[in-house]
Interface confidence: low
C-alpha cells in the first residue's frame, strides 16, 4: 500500500497532516521495502546476491552513484548540490526501472509500485527544488536504445543486470534518505 | 588507522563534576559528528550525548540534560564531556563514539573508544 | 526517548541461524543499526542502515527491517560470535539516538 493510504492514516482523522518532508521521508521508505521484496524474488531465483563485489564491478552499466562531490555526504554537506544530484539520479534510474518491468514473476505488481512511487518521489523533490535550474533531464532517444541494449543481453547478464540495478538503488536511495533528512 | 582515546574518568563524590576527553586520530575529525555513549555495570548501552561536526548543535539524553555539557575542539582534535552534579547512577563506563558518514539526524557508530570508567560513590 | 525492545538472551547451535529481533516505534522511520560487544570490549558496528555490512564484518551476519521491526541474522553461527547484540536508532524526532536493551546471545556445542 503506498504511503498516506495504510489504514492507520484513514483511522486518525485527527493526525496532523505529513509535512513535505515527511512524505518525501515516507515515499522512499516504501520504495525501500519494495526493492527488498524484488532482492528476495532475484536471489532466490539465481545465484547472483552470492557473486563477489569485485565481479559485479566488471559491468558497464552507468547506474548513478554518490559521491564526495556530490554534496550528499556529512562531510562536505551541500543542500543544494545534493538535491540536484538525488533528482538528477532518481531520473537517471527511471530507464532501469523500466528494464525491471518484465523482469519478474510473482513480483511483477511490486516491480510497477517501485516504479511509480519513484515518479511520484521525483514530484515531490522537484516541488522543494522548484528554484534549481541545474537539473538535467536524461535523453529519451539515448534511454530507449539502452533499453533495447539491456533487453538483448543473454540470461546471466540479465540476471546480473537485475540484481545490480536492484542493489545500487538501494544504495542510492538510502543516501538521499539520510540527505534529505538534513534538508 | 581511527583510533578515539578516552581520558578523565575516575572516582567523584555525589554532587561532584568530572571532564571526559576523547582525543581523535586517524580521519578528519572537523567533518564528523561525535557522540558519547555510556555502560552502567552489567548494564546495556545508553546514549548519553552528541554533537554535530562545526559543535553548534548538541542534544542530550533526557537523563543528563542540564547537568552535562558536550563540546568539542576541532583544532585539537578533542571532543569533551562535562560533567556536574553527578550521581551514583551516572557510574558506568563512558565511550567516546565516531558517527558514519551519515546524516546527523540518522546516526549509526563506525568507531568507539575503549572507554573511561566513571564512578559515582561516597 | 522512545524505546527499542530485545530479547534478553538467546541461545543457538553452532552452525544454526540466530534471529535477534529488536521492536520499537521509531523503527516505521528511522534505521536500524546492530552492534556486537563482547565482554570488556567496545561495541562493533556489524549491520547498519537496517541491512548494510560494513567492511570487515563476516557474510554470515544481515539484516532487515519491516514496519517497525528490524531482525539481525547470523546464519552458521560460530563459537566468536557469543556475546551481546544491541540495535540502535534515532528517536522519531531524530534529536536523540536509542539502544535497545541488548540480547545476550549464546552458541552451544
Known amino acids: 500500500v503506498p504511503p498516506g493510504e495504510d489504514s492507520k492514516d484513514v483511522a486518525a482523522p485527527h493526525r496532523q497532516p505529513l509535512t513535505s518532508s515527511e512524505r518525501i521521508d515516507k515515499q522512499i521508505r516504501y520504495i525501500l521495502d519494495g526493492i527488498s521484496a524484488l532482492r528476495k524474488e532475484t536471489c532466490n531465483k539465481s545465484n547472483m546476491c552470492e557473486s563477489s563485489k569485485e565481479a559485479l564491478a566488471e559491468n558497464n552499466l552507468n547506474l548513478p552513484k554518490m559521491a564526495e562531490k556530490d554534496g550528499c555526504f556529512q562531510s562536505g554537506f551541500n543542500e543544494e548540490t545534493c538535491l540536484v544530484k538525488i533528482i538528477t539520479g532518481l531520473l537517471e534510474f527511471e530507464v532501469y526501472l523500466e528494464y525491471l518491468q518484465n523482469r519478474f514473476e510473482s513480483s511483477e505488481e511490486q516491480a510497477r509500485a517501485v516504479q511509480m512511487s519513484t515518479k511520484v518521489l521525483i514530484q515531490f523533490l522537484q516541488k522543494k527544488a522548484k528554484n534549481l535550474d541545474a537539473i538535467t533531464t536524461p535523453d529519451p532517444t539515448t534511454n530507449a536504445s539502452l533499453l533495447t541494449k539491456l533487453q538483448a543481453q543473454n540470461q546471466w547478464l540479465q540476471d546480473m543486470t537485475t540484481h545490480l540495478i536492484l542493489r545500487s538503488f538501494k544504495e542510492f536511495l538510502q543516501s538521499s534518505l539520510r540527505a534529505l533528512r538534513q534538508m | 588507522e581511527v583510533q578515539l582515546v578516552e581520558s578523565g574518568g575516575g572516582l567523584v563524590q555525589p554532587g561532584g563534576s568530572l571532564r571526559l576527553s576523547c582525543a581523535a586520530s586517524?580521519?578528519?575529525?572537523?567533518?564528523?559528528?561525535m557522540s558519547w555513549v555510556r555502560q552502567a555495570p552489567g548494564k546495556g548501552l545508553e546514549w548519553v550525548s552528541a554533537i554535530n561536526s562545526g559543535g553548534g548543535s548538541t542534544s542530550y539524553a533526557d537523563s543528563v540534560k542540564g547537568r552535562f555539557t558536550i563540546s568539542r575542539d576541532n583544532a585539537k582534535n578533542t571532543l569533551y564531556l562535562q560533567m556536574n552534579s553527578l550521581k551514583p547512577e551516572d557510574t558506568a563506563v563512558y565511550y567516546c563514539?565516531?558517527?558514519?558518514?551519515?546524516?546527523?539526524?540518522?546516526?549509526?557508530?563506525?568507531?568507539w573508544g575503549q572507554g573511561t570508567q566513571v564512578t559515582v560513590s561516597s | 526517548q522512545s524505546a527499542l525492545t530485545q530479547p534478553s538472551a538467546l541461545s543457538v547451535t553452532l552452525g544454526q541461524t540466530a534471529k535477534i529481533t529488536c521492536q520499537g516505534g521509531s523503527l516505521g522511520t528511522r534505521y536500524a543499526h546492530w552492534y556486537q560487544q563482547k565482554p570488556g570490549q567496545a561495541p562493533v558496528l556489524v549491520i547498519y542502515?537496517?541491512?548494510s555490512r560494513p567492511s570487515g564484518i563476516p557474510e554470515r551476519f544481515s539484516g532487515s527491517s519491516s514496519g517497525g521491526r528490524a531482525t539481525l541474522t547470523i546464519s552458521g553461527a560460530q563459537a566468536e560470535d557469543e556475546g551481546d547484540y544491541y540495535c540502535q536508532s534515532a528517536d522519531s524526532s531524530g534529536n536523540a539516538s536509542v539502544f535497545g536493551g541488548g540480547t545476550h546471545l549464546t552458541v552451544l556445542g
Open positions: 563514539a565516531k558517527e558514519g558518514d551519515t546524516g546527523w539526524k540518522d546516526p549509526m557508530y563506525d568507531y
Open positions: 542502515d537496517d541491512d
Open positions: 586517524g580521519f578528519t575529525f572537523s567533518s564528523y559528528a
